[in-house]
Amino acid sequence: VPRWRQQWSGPGTTKRFPETVLARCVKYTEIHPEMRHVDCQSVWDAFKGAFISKHPCNITEEDYQPLMKLGTQTVPCNKILLWSRIKDLAHQFTQVQRDMFTLEDTLLGYLADDLTWCGEFNTSKINYQSCPDWRKDCSNNPVSVFWKTVSRRFAEAACDVVHVMLNGSRSKIFDKNSTFGSVEVHNLQPEKVQTLEAWVIHGGREDSRDLCQDPTIKELESIISKRNIQFSCKNIYRPDKFLQCVKNPEDSSCTSEI
């Protein structure tokens, strides 16, 4: 008789999840000399311990502390790029501008990027059938709590000028319910962070509006100002040209507004 299994609304754990995490860890530690001391088998042990045998709607930040400890990494605090709803461009940017870092350029972010995982209460099995959806099931699920934990730590580490890339094509350019809006904004440390600079990325080629005047950006400015952090905003009208100019800043066409 098959054992009854909880059906969640979200997709199940990414196939070959342990192997993927281990393989990513090995690759990352080979590429980043400062993380060569990391034992990837211990990293996986800490990862599995955070969610396996636990109810997938009852995960806490505390569950991830052993993993956080093993993945402790120092990135230049003044070279942090946050993003919201525009991950691909943010990653393309840091692949070119190698001295800047998104969360996914750190070990822990790299391990979990685009993956889903959950376990089942009181069994040592990974649930490959379904996992809780943040909206339909519960917010304290393994994936959401992981990203909340690493995002908070990443924001807390930031200093000087912090950049954030925002998607100008969305109805809410700044969304209070995004990870950036609900976690990172509130964990920037005013005693360390001088300015948050938003880069609003335009979608349409002929879009010449000043999206820095958007009501949601004004809301972001208000939140940031109340936290005693300065705010600035730039329109990136041509993201393709923007990336090209990051690659080749000497190009003559890069003196004009992008």
Partner: antibody, heavy 120, light 107 residues
Framework: QVQLVQSGAEVKKPGSSVKVSCKAS????????FSWVRQAPGQGLEWMGR????????NSAQKFQGRVTITADKSTSTAYMDLSSLRSEDTAVYYC?????????????WGQGTLVTVSS | DIQMTQSPSSLSASVGDRVTITCRAS??????LAWYQQKPEKAPKSLIY???SLQSGVPSRFSGSGSGTDFTLTISSLQPEDFATYYC?????????FGQGTKVEIK
């Protein structure tokens, strides 16, 4: 039927090295990890280290670091344990044992053991 | 390293007896605990994993319980073939560590 077959007994001089092999059959070699566990005469079990063949990575107990090298050859489905600078207290039966890569379960299959005697 | 402490180190019992062996971890290991049986001159054999799950093919008289730091292996009715040494082992973190063993002898 899964089988782990280890190499034969060895007698070694202090200061020398020994390499013990563990050939797996009856399962997908690259889907598992292999640990080495030793047992000195009349003593308990002591974990030495573990290799994941599909990634080619290994770790080991601090006690053995610098002396033990654990490797695997996917082409022959064989795991190896190389212990150097042997001393008399390394006299033991050495076992290889299999678990899943995700380490969610126990060592479900064990080799028959290899007696290594270190004596001058 | 996580220390695993078994008690008793040996015990004498008769066929049909209920036998209980305990294992204590020096820090919390959730349910990442296995129990093994070893007979003289043989390799260990897995009995229990995840603290309470019975390994395939193992008789139901063997059971495990506990989580965190305190664990128990119970043999409900000791059989002649159960006289052996039993080890607990944690697989919560590296290095993997075993208890020192409990020898079950015939009274």
């Amino acid at each position: 039927q899964v089988q782990l077959v280890q190499s034969g007994a060895e007698v070694k001089k202090p200061g020398s090295s020994v390499k013990v092999s563990c050939k797996a059959s009856g399962g997908t070699f690259s889907s598992y990890a292999f640990s080495w566990v030793r047992q000195a005469p009349g003593q308990g079990l002591e974990w030495m280290g573990r290799v994941i063949p599909f990634l080619g990575i290994a770790n080991s107990a601090q006690k053995f670091q610098g002396r033990v090298t654990i490797t695997a050859d996917k082409s022959t489905s064989t795991a190896y344990m190389d212990l150097s600078s042997l001393r008399s207290e390394d006299t033991a039966v050495y076992y290889c044992a299999r678990d899943d890569i995700a380490a969610l379960g126990p060592f479900d299959y064990w080799g028959q053991g290899t007696l290594v005697t270190v004596s001058s | 390293d996580i220390q695993m402490t078994q008690s008793p180190s040996s015990l004498s019992a008769s066929v049909g007896d209920r036998v209980t062996i305990t294992c204590r971890a020096s820090q919390g290991i959730s349910s990442w605990l296995a129990w093994y049986q070893q007979k003289p001159e043989k390799a260990p054999k897995s009995l229990i994993y995840a603290a309470s799950s019975l390994q395939s093919g193992v008789p139901s008289r063997f059971s495990g319980s506990g989580s965190g730091t305190d664990f128990t292996l119970t043999i409900s009715s000791l059989q002649p073939e159960d006289f052996a040494t039993y080890y607990c082992q944690q697989y919560n973190s590296y290095p993997r560590t075993f208890g020192q063993g409990t020898k079950v002898e015939i009274k």
